[in-house]
């Protein structure tokens, strides 16, 4: 590894009302020449490591979390790895980790609070 991928998420929890959609923001800085084929993006529940959503091998692998998650595919190449969580439920409250691997890797956790 040449150096860790820096992953940025908001410090403050994301607050969402039950039934609304929430965006869990996550970003990284692509190096010059970066291609989506190099990207491994994995969203997981921080504590259990349960898979939530992933993007690997150049394509969106889809939601593994009750089919209520989506990426922003048009923004991925610019380093936007944010996750959209639809129809938020009380049970969704907790910490989500955004894990980004290109040549090296990095991760950061964002908290979701449900009101």
């Amino acid at each position: 590894p040449t150096g860790a991928v820096e992953v940025q998420v908001p410090e403050d929890p994301v607050v969402a009302l039950v039934g609304t959609d929430a965006t869990l923001r996550c970003s990284f800085s692509p190096e010059p020449g970066f291609s989506l084929a190099q990207l491994n993006l994995i969203w997981q529940l921080t504590d259990t490591k349960q898979l939530v959503h992933s993007f690997t091998e150049g394509r969106d692998q889809g939601s593994a979390y009750a089919n209520r998650t989506a990426l922003f595919p048009d923004l991925l190449a610019q380093g936007n790895a944010s996750l959209r969580l639809q129809r938020v439920r009380v049970a969704d409250e907790g910490s989500f980790t955004c894990f980004v691997s290109i040549r090296d890797f990095g991760s950061a956790a964002v908290s979701l609070q449900v009101a």
């Epitope: 860790a4 992953v7 491994n40 504590d47 490591k49 898979l51 990095g106």
Partner: antibody, heavy 116, light 108 residues
């Protein structure tokens, strides 16, 4: 290139506390990564012990949670492991490693023997 | 916790031969949540494959990974003398992360 190096006593008495430190060089410990301890004993193979994030958040293996503490010292670019109430079953090579999912790189490992 | 079972325990082969190592998980996991490591005597494990099939930096293309669900495979197309070692699989789809017991690839 990030490199890790474990250090600490190679011999600990039964019921005592095992204390190890992992020095991180070639990069900052404050980067977006989790820092882990993994051990390897002949009887149990590779066993994940726990991890810490630069914010101080920790996760521990359920089987060791009651005896383990992992801490981080960002000013010294190092993190540490404490395992208390040790027995002969804790004799192992202890590795530090970087990663939230897979582990890369690893330290070279340090053998800790629990014996009186 | 998820238990990983590797087979065979030992694989005796000659340089130039193909090696096929198996890793079975006690619960189905997404393929992107599995890694493989190589360990030589007196050394730390070295990451070979992550995401079931992506080679880590600097790993020769004779190493390849595949699989999904509960069955995963590490293949070495043509064994080189430096490939004789112990290989471990590891899952990271559930906490705690767990490893297989290892497969030793030895010279026949």
């Amino acid at each position: 290139q990030v490199q890790l190096q474990e250090s600490g006593p190679g011999l600990v008495k039964p019921s005592g506390t095992l204390s190890l430190t992992c020095a991180v060089s070639g990069g900052s410990i404050s980067t977006s990564n989790w820092w882990n301890w993994v051990r390897q004993s002949p009887g149990k193979g590779l066993e994940w012990i726990g991890e810490i994030y630069p914010t101080g958040n920790t996760n521990y293996s359920p089987s060791l949670k009651s005896r383990v503490t992992i801490s981080i010292d960002k000013s010294k670019n190092q993190f540490s492991l404490k395992l208390n109430s040790v027995t002969a079953a804790d004799t192992a090579v202890y590795y530090c490693a970087r990663g939230y999912n897979w582990f890369d790189p690893w330290g070279q490992g340090t053998l800790v023997t629990v014996s009186s | 916790e998820i238990v990983l079972t590797q087979s065979p325990g030992t694989l005796s082969l000659s340089p130039g031969e193909r090696a096929t190592l198996s890793c079975r998980t006690s619960q189905s996991i997404n393929g992107i949540l599995l890694a493989w490591y190589q360990q030589k005597p007196g050394q730390a494990p070295r990451l070979l494959i992550y995401g079931a099939s992506s080679r880590a930096t600097g790993i020769p293309d004779r190493f390849s990974g595949s699989g999904s669900g509960t069955d995963f495979t590490l293949s070495i197309s043509r064994l080189e003398p430096e490939d004789f070692a112990v290989y471990y699989c590891q899952q990271y789809g559930s906490s705690p992360r767990t490893f297989g017991q290892g497969t030793k690839v030895e010279i026949k």
